[in-house]
Amino acid sequence: VPDKTVRWCAVSEHEATKCQSFRDHMKSVIPSDGPSVACVKKASYLDCIRAIAANEADAVTLDAGLVYDAYLAPNNLKPVVAEFYGSKEDPQTFYYAVAVVKKDSGFQMNQLRGKKSCHTGLGRSAGWNIPIGLLYCDLPEPRKPLEKAVANFFSGSCAPCADGTDFPQLCQLCPGCGCSTLNQYFGYSGAFKCLKDGAGDVAFVKHSTIFENLANKADRDQYELLCLDNTRKPVDEYKDCHLAQVPSHTVVARSMGGKEDLIWELLNQAQEHFGKDKSKEFQLFSSPHGKDLLFKDSAHGFLKVPPRMDAKMYLGYEYVTAIRNLREGTCPEAPTDECKPVKWCALSHHERLKCDEWSVNSVGKIECVSAETTEDCIAKIMNGEADAMSLDGGFVYIAGKCGLVPVLAENYNKSDNCEDTPEAGYFAIAVVKKSASDLTWDNLKGKKSCHTAVGRTAGWNIPMGLLYNKINHCRFDEFFSEGCAPGSKKDSSLCKLCMGSGLNLCEPNNKEGYYGYTGAFRCLVEKGDVAFVKHQTVPQNTGGKNPDPWAKNLNEKDYELLCLDGTRKPVEEYANCHLARAPNHAVVTRKDKEACVHKILRQQQHLFGSNVTDCSGNFCLFRSETKDLLFRDDTVCLAKLHDRNTYEKYLGEEYVKAVGNLRKCSTSSLLEACTFRRP
């Protein structure tokens, strides 16, 4: 019989008492085969973290800073359940740390030196740790003691709770630096008042502070937010302009064998019986003998944290950077305007070899990081382990939902000013063998399908989106008799046709021979009835253009396109017979790396782009013998995006809507995790 006990860790007598009450009340409402609570008492949160890591306890609820500690080795804990605030319809699990300024003050984030600052309090998250952590490497040396470095960075501050004797500049705007509401500039509202009164130039608070203190929109319009990319935005655009997104209060557990499903089952049942306004005799979110015991008193309920989400992703790149800077106190030798090497994310060992060759030829401007799937690469870019990669539009959508931005677009047509003219896109098509003359768009049910990969544009999002509109369900593996859609569940019929050996079968990388455009076409040639690819795929792999044994004798005339009106057309008539127009592949990165990725890639394509004529004796960035490694092989150049610099603008309203509709069929664990952070 599996042990269904969750050992909750308590950090005080009062918490232990509430835990025992929680245990007893849960016993009375949950059947004997359901989850139960046991209580473990420790002296501190850090002791609880260690106890959970050592399998002496299972769960504890922590503030963001402690979630970071819990994640560090050797603890390796992960977030499993989040408290939410506000309403069930619009649950808030995060708050945003922001830098508020007056509208007419005219400086940016990188011009804060010498300004006057207002803080909620020394050592507090939004008011001190996050802004000072992010500014850490700009502080004058020596950076220890930290208070002295901060005092020398700003021309005057109010940092309540600071030592006014040792660091008078930190108390210049609020004499005495009182550590309670007796100090008019203490806390969130106090820091905002410090800005409002004109004492300071910038206030470090949370996003809701402005709304709580200024009910009137006209008054709020007198203020702006400083963004990390050195722009400003209106105060209501905090989701796109903040210093960090911070989880409020989170239950953590072991990463391996951490009982996360059991913890969720327990807490979900607990909130049903003892949540807000549920029971008189025991209330989960109430602390009669203290404050915030086990859970925050202001919480309204729990939400399950998606399993794909580790602590780094949950806390977010900015928060982790800020806290790491403060804790480790390490900065680059001397901050220069030079761009650091761009860490390119390569999929599996095939791309890694090409990336390594690029790295050698770039003289260290490019470094390489490996991952097994595109989603793993996106996650690495999010958390700073990697910086950039080029993605199909379907993954540009996921990357965008995860906070990444497009920087350059692949262009596939030769033109005089290729780099200045991003193209409208390519065509997603359905290809069949000419010999299968009875096959049309309307009778694909029961046929064998070949896809570039799950989540990709031409191979999945467009054809399956159209199909979904027709069949109104997501069971595509039942619609087709079998197929190869790399990235599907291994036991799915949509992995049956794949050719990868062993663990590589149906993997969404080049270890699966039927992966990508060329792979999906090969799948059609060798086993399938229909392949969903791009309009250039057939000509690129026929007429001897692909020397591989399976392709060298293929003829374009032996293939036809399926049109949406039920007719068929020759391959060259793709402009009048396609499923949809697809956005070109694009390079994505984090916002903080945008300028450097743009600069270095433009240099790199001038050195190794399509201007290089002899690829047998020189490195060519856009060539890999039809394997589309790192970039599509038909890329002519990487083009500027001009104003199409967000994923929505880049992909276009129509495509975003189409992928949005398919979201209910999504198996993307990363998309689930990212929409948890930003619904």
Partner: nanobody, 117 residues
């Protein structure tokens, strides 16, 4: 396609030196990029050093300042001079010319380097 044969490995004490050679069966003068990789037991194969036709070199962070890659086009050979060797340099070392397409795994036998006291 040229065949590459690695040699020069062996057992050496920490702090010692070795010089690895990679002899090609044909001309390497027209080959753009040559590189040394290594693979320790249970680890992924990793790039150690690379050199282009023009003599530009790149090194992995862990070997910078200790290893030197060079090529002699007349002798159709690429070298890896390894100084101040550490136990963590223990691995099988392979040479590649990247000319066999990236997705074909044409690796030679490699040469074993063991750093131990």
């Amino acid at each position: 396609q040229v065949q590459l044969v690695e040699s020069g490995g062996g057992l050496v004490q920490p702090g010692g030196s070795l010089r690895l050679s990679c002899a090609a069966s044909g001309s390497i003068a027209s080959i753009n990029t040559m590189a040394w990789y290594r693979q320790a037991p249970g680890k992924q194969r990793e790039l150690v050093a690379g050199i282009t036709r023009s003599g530009t070199t790149t090194y992995a962070g862990s070997v910078k300042g200790r290893f030197t890659i060079s090529r002699d086009n007349a002798k159709n050979t690429v070298y890896l001079q390894m100084n101040s060797l550490k136990p963590e340099d223990t691995a099988v070392y392979y040479c590649t010319d990247y000319s066999s397409s990236y997705y074909q795994d044409y690796w030679g036998q490699g040469t074993q380097v063991t750093v131990s006291s």
